[in-house]
């Protein structure tokens, strides 16, 4: 007999982790004698229903180092149905684990800190009902380095007053380096905290005043977060208590003794001005978050940044004036002193003109590589200014209102009227997600490029070369989600001689000219997905001959354009390696006699082709035969294929990955995978497969991954695979209605390859007989039972 998975109903994962998450357990499982509990160092019991912990629950896990009990008995306000739940923990429950280093009790209805072993290093008590920490709460935890106790008194987990940390309660924790007490209604920073603290997070409390005595003796602090204590509620995505005063009150010497401070968060504090004395002596400050304040005026004349020569990241986002967008904005000259600045976030300050005076003091900063200018209502942008920046690698101008090259005459700062404002009566401070997953993935390839600009989600209708003057250094450009309705003809991007990646998805581009994009000699990746409008104009033809002339192009997306008729009959390119043609009408095109039979054949070096969502109802052998022979990956996912001629895979001698998920295959019949195929991965999940012909997989000797999940299989048979079953690294059979008869052969097979079967312990379930439906195939040992025990359906 094969051995049952040792930690049923849980799953053994790498590095000594037993995963018992989401199993509806009401008690801590007792593992079988065969389970080698001494090797288990991590146990995760997240999101179960364990409401009572006993002294004996963990005695068999003597070497446990990490225990996660999060979300078992959530407090009323955090419970999805607002059930009240009180977790009981017997006094010696955790003391049995003498090696325990990490314990997470978050999201449980506990009111006191249980007794804990002295070995503990990391403790999380967040989103519980613990409202008091005194000297006894954590007595003896001399190894404790990290304590999280967030969210024990706030709108989602309300309490009558506030969390109370008595003075000196944590003083005995001489190794404590991280303390987080966010969302606890604290009105003061607890006094007499251990001087070992390096990270102190007390954001989103009610601490509206901060002075040096609040942080006395905390000379080791490296990160201090006091944000959200005096909020500007007009920018709050959640219930917000208006601050009882006009801003957070900071004593001029609050931080003077914190010479090791590297990160300071003062976000959402209703600050209107910056006092340079706050930052005096912060010689190591490298990250400063001043977002969501009222610093729109202050940043134009402050000298507070004068001495922050080590600052690497500065966040000034959403420092807008309520209901106003400014005509223009000029940063203060003290910005030029930020000689170590690498990243500046100026999203959501709301100004309409971006010209050479806006950011003039940033241009010479030797390390500034990232600049965020999203959501500013910019409608006039002189993009050429970025050509003079010394180190710039990424400028994000997405979600603005740029409609073309800047046409305004250049007002000097002296002439500029900074008070000129425009009322914003319905500015949405919470814009939609910034990019669709597809375009995000496309732009990910720009991470290591020298210079990227994001102009997505603006109001561009036409592209003019003047927009890009002085930007020849640009290697990656996103123009997605605009309204560009142009017939591109090779003159639009002339200055961009080094451009390698261009994202034009979600526009209305008219592709007709053979010279389209020919002005971009270095272009390697081009995204033209979601430009369907021109293709849906009945009677208008489109031409893809431009692809031939892009000699460096490797990646092309024409996805989701509803391309189905009146386009070039061939795509030709020696360079293209990846073509995304998903979301089009190849089904219709291949039905037009032989017109589009050779559509992809001219892509002589193509390695990956995505034909998912192409309304394919039938795939003829000649369709596969006329795909490039170089092809290694073919995706036919989410079509309507009910039949597949498996022997025709021999037409694709280099194919390694075939994705047929989400089709309508009823069976894996019609021959077998052909001899000599190099196929390594086959995904036929989410079909309607009822049966598989014997030896179907047997000849595919390179096969490593097979996904048969979400089908209608009643068994998994060794005969389908032959000896290659032992070569598999993944055999996914989840979500099939397996017939759990006594002596069911699939049990032995799956046990034999159990390390290769995802979710074997719990995700592989019975579909019949009735009493086992929906239960794990190990709910009963099918190898040892008698047939009459299980009634047949």
């Amino acid at each position: 007999l094969g051995t049952l998975p040792a930690f049923l109903p849980c799953e053994l994962k790498p590095h000594g982790l037993v995963d018992c998450n989401w199993l509806f357990l009401k008690s801590v499982p007792r593992f079988s004698a065969a389970a080698s509990c001494s090797n288990i160092t991590r146990l995760s019991l997240i999101s179960n229903r364990i409401h009572h912990l006993h002294n004996s629950d963990f005695v068999h896990l003597s070497n446990l180092r990490q225990l996660n009990l999060k979300w078992n008995c959530p407090p009323t306000g955090l419970s999805p149905l607002h059930f009240s739940c009180h977790m009981t923990i017997e006094p010696r429950t955790f003391l049995a684990m003498r090696t325990l280093e990490e314990l997470n009790l978050s999201y449980n209805g506990i009111t006191t800190v249980p007794r804990l072993p002295s070995s503990l290093v990391n403790l999380s008590l967040s989103h519980t009902n613990i409202l008091v920490l005194d000297a006894n709460s954590l007595a003896g935890l001399y190894s404790l380095r990290v304590l999280f106790m967030d969210g024990n008194c706030y709108y989602k987990n309300p309490c009558t007053g506030a969390v109370k940390v008595t003075p000196g309660a944590l003083l005995g924790l001489s190794n404590l380096t991280h303390l987080s007490l966010k969302y606890n209604n604290l009105t003061k920073v607890p006094r007499q905290l251990p001087p070992s603290l390096e990270y102190l997070l007390v954001s989103y409390n009610l601490i509206v005043k901060l002075g040096p005595e609040d942080l006395a003796n905390l000379t080791s602090l490296r990160v201090l977060d006091v944000g959200g204590n005096c909020r500007r509620c007009d920018h709050a995505p959640n219930p917000c208590i208006e601050c009882g005063q006009k801003s957070l009150h900071l004593h001029p010497e609050t931080f003077h003794h914190l010479s090791h401070l590297e990160g300071l968060v003062l976000k959402d504090s209703s600050l209107h001005t910056l006092n340079s004395s706050w930052f005096q002596g912060l010689v190591n400050l490298s990250v400063l978050d001043l977002s969501e304040n009222f610093l729109y005026e202050s940043i134009t004349h402050t000298n507070a940044f004068q001495n922050l020569t080590r600052l690497r990241k500065l966040n000034l986002s959403f420092n807008y004036r309520k209901k106003v967008s400014f005509a223009r904005l000029h940063l203060a000259s003290s910005f030029k002193n930020l000689v170590s600045l690498q990243e500046l976030n100026m999203n959501g300050i709301f100004f309409r003109l971006l010209n050479k005076y806006t950011l003039r003091w940033l241009a010479d900063l030797p390390k500034l590589h990232t600049l965020h200018l999203q959501m500013n209502f910019i409608n006039q942008a002189q993009l050429s200014i970025f050509g003079t920046f010394r180190a710039l690698r990424f400028v994000d101008l997405s979600d603005n209102r740029i409609s073309g090259p800047s046409t305004l005459s250049e007002a000097t700062p002296e002439e500029a009227d900074d008070a000129e404002q425009e009322e914003l009566l319905s500015a949405d401070p919470h814009p939609a997600p910034l990019s669709t997953p597809a375009s995000k993935n496309f732009m990910d390839r720009c991470k290591n490029f020298k210079f990227t600009m994001d102009l997505s989600r603006n109001n561009l209708v036409t592209i003019k070369p003047e927009m890009f003057v002085n930007l020849s250094r640009l290697q990656c450009l996103s123009l997605s989600h605009n309204s560009i309705a142009q017939a591109v003809n090779g003159s639009q991007f002339l200055p961009l001689t080094n451009l390698q990646v261009l994202d034009l998805s979600h526009n209305k581009l008219d592709l007709y000219h053979w010279k389209s994009f020919s002005e971009l000699p270095q272009l390697q990746a081009l995204d033209l997905s979601y430009n369907s409008q021109p293709f849906s104009m009945k009677g208008i033809g489109h031409n893809f001959s431009f692809v031939t002339h892009l000699s460096m192009l490797q990646s092309l997306s024409l996805a989701h354009n509803d391309i189905h008729t009146r386009v070039s009959s061939h795509l030709n390119s020696n360079s293209v390696r990846f073509l995304d043609f998903s979301g089009n009408g190849m089904g219709r095109m291949w039905d037009e006699g032989g017109l589009y039979l050779h559509f992809f054949q001219g892509l002589s070096g193509l390695l990956k082709l995505d034909l998912s969502q192409n309304n394919l109802h039938i795939l003829r052998p000649q369709n596969l035969d006329n795909l490039p022979k170089s092809l290694k990956l073919l995706s036919l996912r989410d079509n309507y294929l009910s039949f597949f001629n498996w022997t025709s895979l021999s037409f694709l001698p280099n194919l390694e990955v075939l994705d047929l998920a989400g089709n309508q295959l009823k069976a894996l019949t019609n021959g077998t995978l052909p001899n000599g195929t190099l196929l390594q991965k086959l995904d036929v999940s989410s079909n309607s497969i009822v049966s598989v012909v014997p030896a179907f997989f047997a000849l595919a000797v390179e096969l490593k991954e097979v996904n048969l999940s979400h089908n209608i299989l009643k068994t998994v048979d060794r005969s389908w695979f032959g000896p290659i079953v032992m070569n598999l690294t993944v055999l996914d059979v989840r979500s099939n209605p397996l017939h759990c008869a006594c002596g069911a052969a699939f049990v032995d097979l799956l046990l034999e390859v159990q390390t290769k079967v995802p979710g074997l312990a719990n995700g592989v379930k019975c579909g019949s007989p009735g009493q086992l439906q929906g239960r794990s195939i190990f709910a009963q040992d099918l190898r040892l039972c008698l047939d009459e025990v299980l009634s047949w359906d």
């Epitope: 109370k164 008595t166 003075p167 009105t187 003061k188 006094r191 005043k209 002075g211 005595e213 005063q245 006009k246 801003s247 009150h249 004593h251 001029p252 209107h272 001005t273 006092n275």
Partner: antibody, heavy 116, light 106 residues
């Protein structure tokens, strides 16, 4: 040395209003709270309220809210307390005091007499 | 609102002697208490803050102690200039003075 200089004594009629001042020196006026405290004859000290000159925020003791207004003039580093609808009950010595947490410096006091 | 009950309201002691004044808060004030000395015609003078921290320039004859709700001010080795009224002040939540203790020398 921090100094808080209060205006001189005042005699006013019931129903009238009064404004007293507290001129500060030798510290940054906008960085600290300025409080007002009352001492009636033969009685103890009562906190009236504070103003934070840095942003003009104010906080009042409930007993004094409505008839009391605290203001500050940054240019002269002077704080003011305005009391209206005076009655004989308002006869007292009024102190101003500087604080961050606790009151560390006090003015000498202004004596207000409300009498017809 | 936090109430501060100070006692005694007056006391008489001998030069060179020691006196203790107490203040009881209506709730835990986490050591946020200050003590003042007040002489007629002047503004009060800060002696102690955060329950036990002596203000610079104040003689060490003055000391403060306590925690939670109960706090005290002690003056040892009494001198003539110690004749004054003494007040406690809680600054944990807004501000409340105790009723005062008038110290006289026998």
């Amino acid at each position: 040395q921090v100094h808080l200089q209060q205006s001189g004594p005042d005699l006013v009629k019931p129903g009238a209003s009064v404004q007293m001042s507290c001129k500060t020196s030798d510290y940054t006026f906008t960085n600290y709270y300025l409080h007002w405290v009352r001492q009636r004859p033969g009685q103890g000290l009562e906190w009236i309220g504070w103003i934070y000159p840095g942003d003009g925020s104010t906080k009042y003791n409930d007993q004094f809210r409505g008839r009391t207004t605290l203001t500050a003039d940054k240019s002269s580093s002077t704080a003011y307390m305005f009391l209206s609808s005076l009655t004989s009950e308002d006869s007292a010595i009024y102190f101003c005091a500087k604080s961050w947490d606790y009151f560390d410096y006090w003015g000498q006091g202004t004596t207000l007499t409300v009498s017809s | 609102d936090i109430q501060m009950t100070q006692s005694p309201s007056s006391l008489s002691a001998s030069l060179g002697g020691k006196v203790t004044i107490t203040c009881k808060a209506s709730q835990d004030i986490d050591n946020y208490i200050a003590w003042y000395q007040h002489k007629p015609g002047k503004g009060p003078r800060l002696l102690i803050h955060y329950a036990s921290t002596l203000q610079p320039g104040i003689p060490s004859r003055f000391s403060g102690s306590g925690s939670g709700r109960d706090y005290s001010l002690s003056i040892s080795n009494l001198e003539p200039e110690d004749i004054a009224t003494y007040y406690c002040l809680q600054y944990d939540d807004l501000y409340t003075f105790g009723g005062g203790t008038k110290l006289e020398i026998k």
